[in-house]
């Protein structure tokens, strides 16, 4: 019989056999059977004098039982036998369909033999620690999407198939997933010129961020800042009122980058500017302001005394000139007002331009005299409307000179006395509240003649 | 810097009189107003009486217009408060104070320089 039957060398669908024999033989017969059950038998012959043969046309990855036997005159020997399992071959053509921030579909080629399934590994070279995720697949398959992955890390994948509980050998390939963009944008405290832009930093390590900015509907103009890593906000300046604005923010790292995460928001109207009071009078405030660059439906002006009480609100037209100029009217006369002017488009309002500014007192009423004598004028008058400190009575000597009497709120009537017989006198009576001074009440009047 | 020191202060029989005077050193006051305020014990601070720069001009309060006479010298730098008919609530210290308008005299806000104040006392 022949002696140490060796497996030479095995492929997916051949098994190279040697053995020994010590005499000559007229032929070997090479019998070989699948080891699952219902495996066909099959057997060919092998002239005497070789000792070595190749069985072909295998099934890949199955299980042979193999015996050789000596045939001398059509007598068999005993055989000897060998188990071998033909190799699975690797997959072929594995290919990256789509690579993003947390899944990887990779396809490949088809296999044209019989197997069970594709078993296709993914690992976290990044992290060794993390350990694989598996996933079998259905023969007909050839392709497959892995969701769950982590954003910028480096992923080994692996197809193998799976035949009678067996992995064959592994096509190998290796990507990064792509890196996150900031998430989580949100765009806070915009005024006319400024936003603050706020983000959740990616869960990628990235080197920096880039942030971009600029007007939406003009695509090329644009601003980049470079951020590092650990930034997650940036306040933006010098921005056009009532503008629609573009935000974009990109992970770098290396030579990649994420898709941008973008965001849009519209600054706000831009407050009317030098706000003054060109005049008053003791019921109305005469303002004027520098109009914005916006382009605005009209001013809303607000106020109300600082010292409480209702508040009222007037909408003016934009004058087509660089200054609008409006006047309050029916205003309480002495009265300091808080005023506020803010441009108005739509349902929108700026902040306000302020300014605090008062009426003028109103002048005391009715100022006459009541009685005249040699040396003395007796005036009477009625008291202003406004809240005021005292009054100042100024009168006039024969000399040219002005003498002033200062008389507390309450008075309204007074005696100047002192006076010279015959003469013409000019009375003029002032409300005065700290500095502020009302227009004065006038009257003229002539002590009596001396007997 | 200017320093204005008063005099002329002190005890008086109601009815009676006194003449306070106020000088001004430093520096020349030329366009400024110059007057008076009082201060009772326990109560504010009251305008009494003041005088323009050119003398022509004068202002008093209700309560002392026909007892007081304000005048100035301006060769002298002096504002003088001539108190005639004293009465007890003329009791107070006497401050001078100066403007730069007489129309600032009134509640006593806007003076530019004040004098540390002399005593003026009435007994009835």
């Known amino acids: 019989p022949p002696k140490d039957l060796v497996v030479t060398e095995v492929t997916e669908e051949t098994v190279n056999l040697a053995w020994d024999n010590e005499m000559r033989v007229t032929e070997y017969l090479v019998v070989y059977t699948p080891t699952h059950e219902g495996g066909l038998e099959m057997q060919f012959r092998v002239p005497g004098d070789q000792t070595s043969t190749i069985i072909q046309e295998l099934e890949p990855g199955v299980e042979y039982f193999i015996r050789v036997f000596a045939i001398l005159e059509n007598k068999k020997s005993i055989p000897v036998s060998a188990r071998v399992a033909t190799y699975l071959p690797a997959p072929e053509g594995l290919k990256f369909k789509s690579i993003k921030e947390t899944s990887v579909e990779v396809e490949w080629d088809p296999l044209d033999i019989a197997f069970e399934t594709w078993e296709i590994i993914f690992r976290n070279m990044n992290k060794e620690d993390e350990g694989e995720i598996t996933k079998s697949l259905r023969r007909p398959e050839t392709s497959y999407r892995q969701t769950g992955l982590a954003p910028g890390q480096e992923y080994e994948i692996s197809l193998h198939i799976v035949k009678n509980n067996t992995r064959g050998p592994g096509l190998k390939r290796v990507t990064t997933t792509r890196l996150d963009a900031p998430s989580q944008i949100e765009v806070k405290d915009v005024t006319d010129t400024t936003a603050l832009i706020t983000w959740f930093k990616p869960l990628a390590e990235i080197d920096g961020i880039e942030l971009t900015y600029g007007i939406k509907d003009v695509p090329g103009d644009r601003t980049t800042i470079d951020l590092t890593e650990d930034e997650n906000q940036y306040s933006i300046g010098n921005l056009k009122p009532d503008t629609e604005y573009e935000v974009s923010l990109i992970s770098r790292r290396g030579d990649m980058s994420s898709n941008p995460a973008k965001e849009t928001f519209t600054t706000g109207l831009d407050a009317p500017r030098n706000l003054r009071r060109v005049s008053q009078t003791d019921n109305s405030i005469t303002l004027e302001w520098r109009n914005g660059k916006a382009a605005i439906d009209s001013y809303r002006i607000k106020y109300a005394p600082i010292s409480g009480g209702d508040h009222a609100e007037v909408d003016v037209p934009k004058s087509q000139q660089a200054t609008t100029k409006t006047t309050l009217t029916g205003l309480r006369p002495g009265t300091e007002y808080g005023i506020g002017v803010s441009a108005v488009k739509e349902d929108k309002e700026s902040n306000p331009a302020t300014i605090n500014a008062a009426t003028e007192l109103d002048t005391p009423k009715d100022l006459q005299v009541s009685e005249t004598a040699e040396t003395s004028l007796t005036l009477l008058w009625k008291t202003p409307l406004a809240k005021f400190d005292r009054y100042r009575l100024n009168y006039s000597l024969p000399t040219g000179q002005w003498v002033g009497v200062q008389l507390p709120r309450n008075t309204t009537s007074y005696v100047l006395r002192g006076l010279e017989p015959g003469q013409e006198y000019n009375v003029l009576l002032t409300a005065e509240k700290g500095r502020h001074k009302s227009k004065p009440a006038r009257v003229k009047a002539s002590t009596e003649q001396a007997p | 810097q200017v320093q204005l020191v008063e005099t002329g202060g002190g005890l008086a029989q109601a009815g009676g009189s006194l003449r306070l005077s106020c000088a001004a050193s430093?520096?020349?006051?030329?366009?400024?107003?110059m007057g008076w305020f009082r201060q009772a014990p326990g109560k504010e601070r009251e305008f009494v009486a003041a005088?323009?720069?050119?003398?022509?001009?004068?202002y008093y309060d209700y309560t002392v217009q026909g007892r007081f006479t304000i005048s100035k010298d301006n060769a002298k730098n002096t504002v003088n408060l001539q108190m005639n008919s004293l009465k007890p609530e003329d009791t107070a210290v006497y401050y001078c104070?100066?403007?730069?308008?007489?129309?600032?005299f009134g509640d006593g806000y806007e003076m530019d320089y004040w004098g540390d104040g002399t005593q003026v006392t009435v007994s009835s």
């Open positions: 005088i323009s720069w050119s003398g022509r001009n004068t």
């Open positions: 104070a100066v403007s730069r308008s007489l129309d600032e």
């Open positions: 430093g520096r020349t006051l030329s366009g400024y107003a």
